[in-house]
Interface confidence: medium
């Protein structure tokens, strides 16, 4: 039996969000079963459907309504003919959308004007994605490649960060970390420090 | 003419064994998946199962999975439901339907009693 | 398992829009279908694949999905579209399908 994914290049990259059918011709065979398979494990989909283009010659059709990140991998179709177990050529699915965020900023408890990092990290496809910091309602850096780590220098009260993550299909806004104030007991080395600190919030640096 | 030409109403005792069968006509059996589906008096539908085209592989509503076993016979065009223990809840009206997702062909039904 | 959720009732004057819904967490990654059955008869398949009307059907029914909702719209519901009305999907996996609970479609 000849088997081929039709309709598809080689790789076939789609929307998050959009419909995708990935179609299986299958010649030579009178009754074939076919069967898709992503990433080596069988799809176990009912949606799909056949079509007899003639007696010997069918195509069958797997159709994804709504494509999401999960959906992308490798895909093919296979049947059973006479006890061996034919499969066509795979088609790589390339699922495109807004940045996915791998590393979100952490809430974190902090001397006043003590430094401290946060971590932001998202993915594609599509790449390139670029960080972009906020404190609070502020851009305070980039846009800058991700992953991106932001030094602070210090606060002197509870303060909010998050980060935006922005690539050609868009941008995804981060969780949104609390930094909140150590309480330092009175007396502390770290007490009398903050007195030989200036109070005002400091620019942070912004680096890879 | 596409038909599906079910067997006949059933009384059955529970814990008794039956089988009910759909035989199709007018379209090539091995080109359509056929699913089975449950309706009890005065309630709605219910997907049972179905059985592929070639009859190699069958899929199961979790409710009914181990409770039947929907079988075909290609060579007389003849699609099964088969019980190995009836119980007093499975007396319902049984419906084969020629496809999975496109139910486009329905059968008469076969009406299932199961009393003692 | 699986479930999808139908309202029981929905009751129209003739000539009015009636709208069916249809509750299901796998409805943004699967289609949803709809079938009608008239009192004593088998069920017919009136929209598939969301929003295709199946053949034979009359241009008054329309479907429609948006995230996890899908909706059969009547628009100018006729006495003869007195019946129950099921939506028909499949599981997140896909691995096995599922009616709704029926909708009852009076049109007073």
């Known amino acids: 039996a000849g088997l081929k994914l039709m309709g598809a290049p080689v790789k076939l990259t789609v929307s998050q969000g959009q419909p995708v059918k990935l179609n299986c011709s299958v010649e030579g065979m009178e009754e074939p079963d076919i069967q898709w398979v992503k990433d080596g494990a069988v799809v176990q989909n009912l949606d799909q459907l056949y079509i007899p283009v003639s007696e010997q010659h069918w195509i069958g059709f797997l159709s994804l309504k709504s494509v999401e990140r999960s959906d992308a991998g490798r895909y093919w179709c296979q049947v059973e003919d006479g006890g061996e177990t034919e499969i066509s050529q795979p088609v790589w699915l390339t699922v495109e959308g807004v940045p996915f965020f791998t590393v979100e900023p952490k809430d974190l408890a902090v001397p006043p004007n003590a430094p401290f990092q946060l971590s932001c990290e998202a993915v594609g496809p599509p790449e390139p994605v670029t960080i972009v910091w906020w404190r609070g309602t502020t851009k305070i850096g980039g846009p800058a490649p991700s992953p991106s780590v932001l030094n602070v220098t210090g606060v002197t009260q509870s303060t909010m960060f998050s980060c935006e993550a922005h690539n050609l299909k868009g941008l995804a806004s981060s969780r949104t970390a609390t930094v909140h104030l150590q309480l330092v007991p009175r007396g502390s080395s770290a007490h009398h420090h903050h007195h030989h600190h200036h109070s005002a919030w400091s620019h942070p640096q912004f680096e890879k | 003419e596409v038909q599906l030409v079910q067997s006949g109403a059933d009384v059955k005792k529970p814990g008794a064994s039956l089988t009910i069968s759909c035989q199709a006509s007018?379209?090539?059996?091995?080109?359509?998946?056929i699913s089975w589906v449950r309706q009890k008096p005065g309630k709605g539908l219910e997907w049972m199962g179905s059985?592929?085209?070639?009859?190699?592989?069958?899929h199961y509503g979790p409710s009914f999975q181990g409770h039947v076993t929907i079988s075909a016979d290609r060579s007389t065009a003849t699609a099964y439901l088969q019980w190995r223990s009836l119980e007093a809840s499975d007396t319902a009206m049984y419906y084969c339907?020629?496809?999975?997702?496109?139910?486009?062909?329905w059968g008469p039904g076969t009406l299932v009693t199961v009393s003692s | 398992s699986y479930e999808l959720t139908q309202p029981p009732s929905v009751s129209v004057s003739p000539g009015q829009t009636a709208r069916i819904t249809c509750s299901g967490d796998?409805?943004?990654?699967?289609?949803a279908y709809w079938y009608q059955q008239k009192s004593g008869q088998a069920p017919v398949l009136v929209i598939y694949?969301?929003?295709k009307r199946s053949s034979g059907i009359p241009e008054r029914f329309s479907g429609s999905s948006s995230g996890t909702m899908a909706t059969l719209t009547i628009s100018g519901a006729q006495v003869e579209d007195e019946a129950d009305y099921y939506c028909?999907?499949?599981?997140?996996?896909?691995?096995?399908?599922?009616f709704g609970g029926g909708t009852k479609l009076t049109v007073l």
């Open positions: 694949e969301d929003s």
């Open positions: 796998a409805l943004p990654k699967k289609y």
């Open positions: 339907v020629r496809g999975y997702t496109h139910l486009r062909t």
């Open positions: 028909y999907s499949a599981n997140q996996r896909g691995n096995y399908m599922v």
């Open positions: 059985i592929t085209r070639s009859s190699s592989r069958t």
């Open positions: 007018g379209y090539t059996f091995t080109d359509y998946w």
